[in-house]
Interface confidence: low
């Protein structure tokens, strides 16, 4: 999906209003020095992409993240601020809405949450950058 | 054009050292899960070390574990593998991978054109 | 370990005609989070391998619509719906589902 014609405000107030809080409380217990945060981003739809790509592909190291509140919440957000959007992810998501709910949250997928704190921290500057 | 190409390969005899690098180019080198598989000649592909993007967590093949190291460099788009006390059975073509995590569901999308490492006295 | 076992080891394919190669794990690749960790990768003589299909039965970018994967659990089958030259080489399944990442032997495809 390109996400050149999203609308980046919309989805930044969203962010900052609930997906934050979300993703926050989900890496609650963890120092912010506990991993290192390597992922980046060069401009708004790239970021998007990226965030797109580690909060919902799968991986058998971290299952359960597209199950998660702020995974719900972010495909909302794109849904409604990305036209066309969420025609491209009905395939992409069928196996997700079958998957069962976990409640254990694990180290490995901590390490994946950290760096989607700093694909949206990212996000919002190159926002602020170009106004 | 994204490219992944090895270097560091050559001859080394057996208990001796190697260190293989992996140069990474066109996409997000620190975005991604990076795989070493290496191919002895005429036989299939066997999976060596992978290592998540943030270096968190790495994991071995059995059958290096305890001699080789994988690392990688973020700030450099590099990926490393250190292979110590080497032998014969290690004689292999080594490819850098990118893959092994969340992109593609684990598999191993983008390949370097590999570099041969020959074990002998 | 998970063992992938590939068959037929070789194969010899008319232009045109289609081809069929299994690949059976010694245990079922399918995750709690419904996705099956099974892909597929060509390696065309002289070359490295590539990723044709992924999770199963998605293609890779730029793989052409003829070959496609299919399959659950245990068994996987990748089909060629019309071989064509450029597809003779040696393919692999792997799964990816736990460490050790395993390979099956590979088959090889041959022009007749």
């Known amino acids: 999906y390109d996400f050149t014609n999203c609308d980046f405000q919309k989805i930044e107030a969203d962010y900052l209003r609930t997906i934050s809080k979300d993703l926050i409380t989900y890496m609650s217990g963890t120092k912010s020095t506990d991993f290192n945060n390597t992922v980046s981003c060069s401009n708004r739809p790239h970021c998007l992409t990226e965030i797109q790509s580690l909060t919902f592909n799968p991986t058998p190291r971290c299952a359960s993240l597209a199950k998660e509140m702020f995974a719900r919440k972010t495909k909302a957000t794109l849904a409604l601020w990305c036209p066309g959007y969420s025609e491209t992810q009905i395939n992409a998501t069928q196996a997700m809405k079958k998957a069962r709910k976990s409640k254990v949250t694990t180290n490995k997928c901590l390490e994946q949450v950290s760096q989607l704190l700093g694909l949206w921290r990212r996000f919002i500057r190159t926002l602020l950058k170009k106004q | 054009e994204v490219q992944l190409v090895e270097s560091g390969g050559g001859l080394v005899q057996p208990g001796g050292s190697l260190r293989l690098s992996c140069a990474a180019s066109g996409f997000t080198f620190s975005n991604y899960d990076m795989t070493w598989v290496r191919q002895a000649p005429g036989k299939g592909l066997e999976w060596v070390s992978s290592i998540t993007f943030a270096s968190s967590y790495i994991y071995y093949a059995d059958s290096v574990k305890g001699r080789f190291t994988i690392s990688r460099d973020n700030a450099k788009n590099s990926l490393s593998l250190q292979m110590n006390s080497l032998r014969a059975e290690d004689t292999a073509v080594y490819y850098c991978?990118?893959?092994?995590?969340?992109?593609?569901?684990?598999?191993?999308?983008?390949w370097g054109q590999g570099v041969l490492v020959t074990v002998s006295s | 370990d998970i063992v992938m076992t590939q068959t037929p080891l070789s194969l010899s394919v008319t232009p045109g005609e289609p081809a069929s190669i299994s690949c059976r794990s010694s245990q079922s690749l399918l995750h709690s989070n419904e996705y099956t960790y099974l892909h597929w990768y060509l390696q065309k003589p002289g070359q490295s391998p590539q990723l044709l299909i992924y999770?199963?039965?998605h293609r890779a970018s730029g793989v052409p619509d003829r070959f496609s994967g299919s399959g659950s659990d245990t068994d996987f089958t990748l089909k060629i719906s019309r071989v064509e030259a450029e597809d003779v080489g040696v393919y692999y399944c792997?799964?990816?589902?736990?460490?050790?990442?395993?390979f099956g032997g590979g088959t090889k495809v041959e022009i007749k």
């Open positions: 991978t990118r893959g092994g995590g969340a992109y593609y569901g684990g598999s191993l999308d983008v």
């Open positions: 792997e799964q990816t589902l736990q460490t050790p990442f395993t």
């Open positions: 999770l199963v039965s």
